[in-house]
C-alpha cells in the first residue's frame, strides 16, 4: 500500500491522543534505554509503511502484536485516513489469522514495540533530517 495520500495530521493527532498511550502501557515496566532503535524511516509515507509492517506482520519471536490495543487503533486510523487502505489488507489479515499464536508478551515483542515507538516519534517530526 502507498501511504502517500494519507491525512498525516489526523493520524498524528490520533497517535498523540491515544495510540501513544497504549504503546506506553504495553511497555510499562521496561526502561526506555533497554532497546536500541534499529529501524528507521525517512519521511511520513515511509514511516507508515514501517509502522504497518512492524505492527501487523508476525516476526520471529513475536507473532502477537496485531491483537494489541495499539494495533487495533492503528488499523482504525490508517483505514479512516488513508484512502483505500482497508481494501488492501484483506489477504494480509487472512494469512495472518492462519499463523496466529497464543498472545504472549515476549522480550522480542517488547523490542519490536520499542522500535514502533521510535518510528511513530519520527513520523511526528517529518522535517527533521535523517540521522
Amino acid at each position: 500500500y502507498d501511504f502517500t495520500n494519507c491525512d498525516f495530521e489526523k493520524i498524528k493527532a490520533a497517535y498523540l491522543s491515544t495510540i501513544s498511550k497504549d504503546l506506553i502501557t504495553y511497555m510499562s515496566g521496561t526502561k526506555s534505554t533497554e532497546f536500541n532503535n534499529t529501524v528507521s524511516c525517512s519521511n511520513r509515507p515511509h514511516c507508515l509503511t514501517e509502522i504497518q509492517s512492524l505492527t501487523f506482520n508476525p516476526t520471529a519471536g513475536c507473532a502477537s502484536l496485531a491483537k494489541e490495543m495499539f494495533a487495533m487503533k492503528t488499523k482504525a486510523a490508517l483505514a479512516i485516513w488513508c484512502p483505500g487502505y482497508s481494501e488492501t489488507q484483506i489477504n494480509a489479515t487472512q494469512a495472518m489469522k492462519k499463523r496466529r499464536k497464543r498472545k504472549v508478551t515476549t522480550n522480542k515483542c517488547l523490542e519490536q514495540v520499542s522500535q514502533l515507538q521510535g518510528l511513530w516519534r519520527r513520523f511526528n517530526r517529518p522535517l527533521l533530517k535523517q540521522q
Epitope: 489526523k10 498523540l16 491515544t18 498511550k21 491483537k67 490495543m69 482504525a76 489479515t93
Partner: antibody, heavy 122, light 108 residues
Framework: QVQLVQSGAEVKKPGSSVKVSCKSS????????INWVRQAPGQGLEWMGQ????????TYNGNFKGRVTITADKSTSTAYMELSSLRSEDTAVYYC???????????????WGQGTTVTVSS | EIVMTQSPATLSVSPGERATLSCSVS???????LHWYQQKPGQSPRPWIF???NLASGIPARFSGSGSGTEFTLTISSLQSEDFAVYYC?????????FGGGTKVEIK
C-alpha cells in the same frame, strides 16, 4: 448522516441460536470497527466483541466462551452477531456500535444502533 | 480483565443541585482511554465524555469530567430535567472492553 439500523426483536428457545443484523449507512463501512454490546433487563452494558469489516478481523470477549460469532458483509454494509447455545440469561437488548476517533481524536463508540431485543424462553 | 466500579448506584438530586459520579478502575489506565455514556430509558447509550474530560458534540458545559489513574469523576454543576438518566463509564485500555455498572441520576 451515520446510521446503524438493527433487525427486529426475536424470541428463541433455550439451546437455539440467534443472529442479529446491523446495517450501516452514511460512512465508509470497511474502515470502522463495529462492536456488539448487550444489556440484560435492568442491568449494565457488556461488550461482546468487535469486527473490522475491511478484512474480517475480530476480537471477542472470552467470557462468552466461543458462543459468539461476529461477521460482516461488505456488499450490503451489514454486520452480524450470532449467539449460540442460548439460555435464559441471554435475554437482553443487543446493540451494535461503531467505534471511531472523535473530534479530540479519542477512540470510542461514537454511533449506536437502536438495539434488538432477544428473549430466550421455553 | 479491568473491573469498573461506579458509585453510587443511584444518586437522588434536586434540579439545580450539583451531582458527582465516581468511576473506580481496578488497574491504572490512561485518561485518554476513559469514556462516559448517557442512557435514558428505552434508548441506546449516547457518547457523553471522551478521554476523561472532553465533551462529545452538543453536550452542555455544565458537564465536566476529571480524574487519572484509577479514579475518575463526572460532574454536573447544576442538574437540569433532561440530565436525569443512567451514566456509564467505559475503558478502552485493554481487552475485553468493560463498562461500569452505571449510576442512575434520579429526581429527589
Amino acid at each position: 448522516q451515520v446510521q446503524l439500523v438493527q433487525s427486529g426483536a426475536e424470541v428463541k428457545k433455550p439451546g437455539s441460536s440467534v443472529k442479529v443484523s446491523c446495517k450501516s449507512s452514511g460512512y465508509a463501512f470497511s474502515s470502522y470497527w463495529i462492536n456488539w454490546v448487550r444489556q440484560a433487563p435492568g442491568q449494565g452494558l457488556e461488550w461482546m466483541g468487535q469486527i473490522f469489516p475491511g478484512d474480517g478481523d475480530t476480537t471477542y470477549n472470552g467470557n462468552f466462551k466461543g458462543r459468539v460469532t461476529i461477521t460482516a458483509d461488505k456488499s450490503t454494509s451489514t454486520a452480524y452477531m450470532e449467539l449460540s447455545s442460548l439460555r435464559s440469561e441471554d435475554t437482553a437488548v443487543y446493540y451494535c456500535a461503531r467505534s471511531g476517533f472523535d473530534y479530540g481524536y479519542f477512540y470510542a463508540m461514537d454511533y449506536w444502533g437502536q438495539g434488538t431485543t432477544v428473549t430466550v424462553s421455553s | 480483565e479491568i473491573v469498573m466500579t461506579q458509585s453510587p448506584a443511584t444518586l437522588s438530586v434536586s434540579p439545580g443541585e450539583r451531582a458527582t459520579l465516581s468511576c473506580s478502575v481496578s488497574s491504572s489506565i490512561s485518561s485518554s482511554n476513559l469514556h462516559w455514556y448517557q442512557q435514558k430509558p428505552g434508548q441506546s447509550p449516547r457518547p457523553w465524555i471522551f478521554g476523561t474530560s472532553n465533551l462529545a458534540s452538543g453536550i452542555p458545559a455544565r458537564f465536566s469530567g476529571s480524574g487519572s489513574g484509577t479514579e475518575f469523576t463526572l460532574t454536573i454543576s447544576s442538574l437540569q430535567s433532561e440530565d436525569f438518566a443512567v451514566y456509564y463509564c467505559q475503558q478502552w485500555s485493554s481487552y475485553p472492553l468493560t463498562f461500569g455498572g452505571g449510576t442512575k441520576v434520579e429526581i429527589k
